[in-house]
Interface confidence: low
Amino acid sequence: FDLVDYEEVLGKLGIYDADGDGDFDVDDAKVLLGLKERSTSEPAVPPEEAEPHTEPEEQVPVEAEPQNIEDEAKEQIQSLLHEMVHAEHVEGEDLQQEDGPTGEPQQEDDEFLMATDVDDRFETLEPEVSHEETEHSYHVEETVSQDCNQDMEEMMSEQENPDSSEPVVEDERLHHDTDDVTYQVYEEQAVYEPLENEGIEITEVTAPPEDNPVEDSQVIVEEVSIFPVEEQQEVPPETNRKTDDPEQKAKVKKKKPKLLNKFDKTIKAELDAAEKLRKRGKIEEAVNAFKELVRKYPQSPRARYGKAQCEDDLAEKRRSNEVLRGAIETYQEVASLPDVPADLLKLSLKRRSDRQQFLGHMRGSLLTLQRLVQLFPNDTSLKNDLGVGYLLIGDNDNAKKVYEEVLSVTPNDGFAKVHYGFILKAQNKIAESIPYLKEGIESGDPGTDDGRFYFHLGDAMQRVGNKEAYKWYELGHKRGHFASVWQRSLYNVNGLKAQPWWTPKETGYTELVKSLERNWKLIRDEGLAVMDKAKGLFLPEDENLREKGDWSQFTLWQQGRRNENACKGAPKTCTLLEKFPETTGCRRGQIKYSIMHPGTHVWPHTGPTNCRLRMHLGLVIPKEGCKIRCANETKTWEEGKVLIFDDSFEHEVWQDASSFRLIFIVDVWHPELTPQQRRSLPAI
């Protein structure tokens, strides 16, 4: 019940691919560090051919000192990577207790109570996804595939789609065959989901001196896990902004964690030999080597940790949830051994939490994070992670308390600020959220350069009438989160024509437009009949898009699926539409009636994807008072006429008439999407 779409997460660090080889690797890090020239001509390896990472340098090698220049470079790279990604987490869901109950854990099944769209985390579902799609960012750090993507959609709230109920798994670029593909149930709310930062998940680890496990001296460790960064177009590597500052560099370069206890130092040669196999990607051999060490030295924390890492690598290689569950268990075993070095304990539990999140076991992950915070009470980064853990299960109250605690101790913690601001905004404390979001983003701290924060800061400013909103959208655009200041959708295919308003001729869908305009009265009458006889079919917009007023929708198609129940209410309209696959097959859109009553204002908002265009057919339009702005042009509806706009651009609606306004919304695929893309892009 708890699978991960591995697809989503393999070999996709395009955002940091500085040398053009199709993935992020040590060479890219060197380029970003200025240790190597950026390649301009090497063609990117098609993702299908890219080697899956085997977590180079995951954690720190057993050897304590860098042996040569290469090692020193790697150490610098770790620092850089640390800047790039603040060890973060994923989404999903779990109930497994730490020392869990002995009954049948709900854990994995738990997510089966959720409707979110991720497909088995390791086992992928859609084998033909378009490779150029990018998500402009609702991804942040680390790991998951899961609903990461979805989140944005809701977060960005599929604006005009109050009832959009299925999330999306975006751009799966690598596709691996799997035996058991099971659909993972997930939900589709607007939500937190730590960005899928795809990639290198660098973990801040505090390494207390061995004799005093409480004081934490910061250490960084790189945990590499590969996720799709959706090749965002021109995303400036997050690092370049920060590492030029010598102070920053100093701050990041930290001592290596101590991973060996006294006993493990006596078997260091054996540990090194096994670790070398793992580093070289000989995972099966490494697994056997570490298993043998665990058998020989059952009390060795480092051997047990090596076994966990190998299982973790093997899970990634085989795209197996089952193997990953074993790794999660082994990371837990490390923590239960006697005399575990504090650094190793922290690394092991952090990775356990991370992998639990990857599998969607949010609850189990939360318990692991709670334990980490108890063990290392002075480590702010762990508290920040714990806050995210609470957010991921929807427990805003506890998350808020955690961030309040962090900010009371470290008032300038940018990570805590953006998340605290995020929570305030979710609680509709719009004005209060602004300074936290703003100062948090301005801090430049790891984990703060996330499209969601720019999105919500701009949105909050717009809602309080602060014109500075567009400055933040501009910055979000510059940093690669939005396609432009106006076009702020996050599920995007690169290179599609982008303009707010379209003519029927430009879309190529002239037959559909003619059919809608010829049959507008039939469509109108069926909509009015539903309003009269089955008003309950019109569902209110529930995504906090309205400043005020009353706005409901009655959906006939959603995600390319016909709603049979709804079509009973508008049978002729449904029959009419069946002839037009550009709309009925548009899995990133809906077909629906939209009724808006007088006194309604819909805040400026943005749709989730640039893959669709939205047609509005006027059905009942009051003489004056109704208007729609898309980008910087405002239009009005006419009865029997179609307006076409790209709702990935900011749009806003006013209804100040004296009677209701009824329109018919028909989403169509963006005309430049190929048939193959239309087939393979995941639904929204």
Epitope: D110, M114, G394
Partner: antibody, heavy 127, light 107 residues
Framework: QVQLVESEGGVVQPGRPLRLSCAAS????????MHWVRQAPGKGLEWVAV????????RYAGSVKGRFTISRDNSKNTLYLQMNSLRPEDTGVYYC????????????????????WGQGTTVTVSS | GIVLTQSPATLSLPPRERVTLSCGTS??????LAWYQQKPGRAPRVLTY???NKAAGTPARFSGSGSETDFTPAISSLEPEDFAVYYC????????AFSPGTKVDIK
């Protein structure tokens, strides 16, 4: 408004089957997992079964496993409970209940409380 | 499966009194515990989920606390409409289970 309405239950002889249905309206039925819960006369609540939002997985209480089947038809916004080999101890009021979902912006996560319940339908198993 | 216990089975109290209920679980359920209220002849309704999070429409006088195996919801001041049966429910492990219930009636 959000509503769940169970079909008429009825009196049925031991060993015979009965199918209950639960019609949902006023919300996006296909986005919610759904439960059946029952209550024997004068007794407490007993969880019976749950089904995922898309019908792809289900779970049952030990007392009904192998005899009851939960299913759903999202195109009809309807939840079903097929009860076979009924026993006198299956007598009671049967409720369908929706799994509530988060409305915050941070987590695509369903809360697992049963946030909307039907009015209940009585099933009597007696010879 | 996990067994839930509740005590007492019946509680007789006057209006405006503070009431504390208790629910115990045979194993650690972390915070995966919800409280429901049921009035005679009516369907139950959720009051709190995940121990302390109030469901929509739950009055402020209701609160929940506890973790792992011991949980204590409270009503700060009983109103006439609060006289009902209260159940706790765990969703940590399958099968999900309800407690036997505590009936709160008017003294």
């Amino acid at each position: 408004q959000v509503q769940l309405v169970e079909s008429e239950g009825g009196v049925v002889q031991p060993g015979r089957p009965l199918r209950l249905s639960c019609a949902a309206s006023g919300f996006a039925f296909s986005s919610h997992a759904m439960h059946w819960v029952r209550q024997a006369p004068g007794k407490g609540l007993e969880w019976v079964a749950v089904i995922s939002h898309d019908g792809s997985r289900d779970r049952y209480a030990g007392s009904v496993k192998g005899r009851f089947t939960i299913s759903r038809d999202n195109s009809k916004n309807t939840l079903y409970l097929q009860m076979n080999s009924l026993r006198p101890e299956d007598t009671g009021v049967y409720y369908c209940a929706r799994v509530g979902r988060s409305s915050n912006w941070f987590s695509r996560y369903y809360y697992y409380d049963m946030d909307v319940w039907g009015q209940g339908t009585t099933v009597t198993v007696s010879s | 499966g996990i067994v839930l216990t509740q005590s007492p089975a019946t509680l007789s109290l006057p209006p405006r009194e503070r009431v504390t209920l208790s629910c115990g679980t045979s194993q650690n359920v972390s915070h995966h515990l919800a409280w429901y209220q049921q009035k005679p002849g009516r369907a139950p309704r959720v009051l709190t989920y995940d121990v302390a999070n109030k469901a929509a429409g739950t009055p402020a006088r209701f609160s929940g606390s506890g973790s792992e195996t011991d949980f204590t919801p409270a009503i700060s001041s009983l109103e006439p409409e609060d006289f009902a049966v209260y159940y706790c429910q765990q969703r940590s492990n399958w099968p999900q289970a309800f407690s036997p219930g505590t009936k709160v009636d008017i003294k």
